[in-house]
């Protein structure tokens, strides 16, 4: 697995440099997330063809992924900064649930989806600093999720396939929506 | 385990009209989305149509408002209704169901866990 932000070599090399503000960490924990998921999506693509046909082979999707709309503030039309920081802090704490799905599912990226896992979970503790109104954030109920979790495993080898297809592709998206959203924070 | 038997295959004139049935054994149908498959001779199983467990109709386009699939759970049966029939429909039609409560509704064979035997359609012109 890649070393964490805050751990590579260059940080020892250079031990003078100024420390990361605030903001500076969380985008780069954010960018490091993006590239376990670039390296798990990389295994499943190969693993089957889901990522080129799973457009039109789904009719219904239940999963219920957390997704940016207009009405969370995080675009630039309607931009919210509190509205917008509730709502990616939300969503990720619904992503944890999807995220400890995943675990299972990498045969040659099993370190990598462990990362992702514990580095969104560091992310998240970033993000509750950063928010003025934690009041404001629902966390899931862990009884549903434990129940989701059953249901996402029940399915059939092919479904699961195409659930960790799914769940990839919308943390991606979910997670650069946040990052341009925090670039203007 | 799940059983799924198709009734109401047979031969038709162009323009004319079948009804498929279903019958699935089993108490949990309810939960299951169930779907139609068909397979004309040295072709792939293609596709028909599927109804979810929520109760959302989907087609494939060749068959939009000719085909409709209904699902009566009181009686562990799905339906499927085929007006306007072409000679391109002609086939073995099957039944399909998913294990219980599945989050992704798919029309790839892959997504379905239990078969029946299938039933054939004939349209002659």
């Known amino acids: 697995a890649p070393v964490p932000p805050g751990e590579d070599s260059k940080d020892v090399a250079a031990p003078h440099r100024q420390p990361l503000t605030s903001s500076e960490r969380i985008d780069k924990q954010i960018r490091y997330i993006l590239d376990g998921i670039s390296a798990l999506r990389k295994e499943t693509c190969n693993k089957s063809n889901m990522c080129e046909s799973s457009k039109e082979a789904l009719a219904e999707n239940n999963l219920n992924l957390p997704k940016m709309a207009e009405k969370d503030g995080c675009f630039q039309s309607g931009f919210n900064e509190e509205t917008c920081l509730v709502k990616i802090i939300t969503g990720l704490l619904e992503f944890e649930v999807y995220l400890e799905y995943l675990q299972n599912r990498f045969e040659s990226s099993e370190e990598q989806a462990r990362a992702v896992q514990m580095s969104t979970k560091v992310l998240i503790q970033f993000l509750q600093k950063k928010a003025k109104n934690l009041d404001a954030i629902t966390t899931p109920d862990p009884t549903t999720n434990a129940s989701l979790l059953t249901k996402l495993q029940a399915q059939n080898q092919w479904l699961q396939d195409m659930t960790t297809h799914l769940i990839l592709r919308s943390f991606k998206e979910f997670l650069q929506s946040s990052l341009r959203a925090l670039r203007q924070m | 385990q799940v059983q799924l038997a198709e009734t109401g295959g047979g031969s038709v004139q162009a323009g004319g009209s079948l009804t498929l049935s279903c019958a699935a054994s089993?108490?949990?149908?309810?939960?299951?989305?169930m779907g139609w498959f068909r397979q004309a001779p040295g072709k792939e199983r293609e596709f028909v149509a599927v109804?979810?467990?929520?109760?959302?109709?989907y087609y494939t386009d060749s068959v939009k408002g000719r085909f409709t699939i209904s699902r009566d759970d009181a009686k562990n049966t799905v339906y499927l209704q085929m007006n306007s029939l072409k000679p391109e429909d002609t086939a073995v039609y099957y039944c399909?169901?998913?294990?219980?409560?599945?989050?992704?509704?798919?029309?790839?064979?892959?997504?379905?866990?239990?078969w029946g035997q299938g039933t054939q359609v004939t349209v002659s012109s």
């Open positions: 399909a169901a998913t294990s219980e409560h599945v989050m992704l509704v798919v029309t790839t064979r892959g997504g379905y866990d239990y």
């Open positions: 089993g108490r949990t149908f309810s939960s299951r989305a």
């Open positions: 109804i979810s467990w929520t109760g959302s109709p």
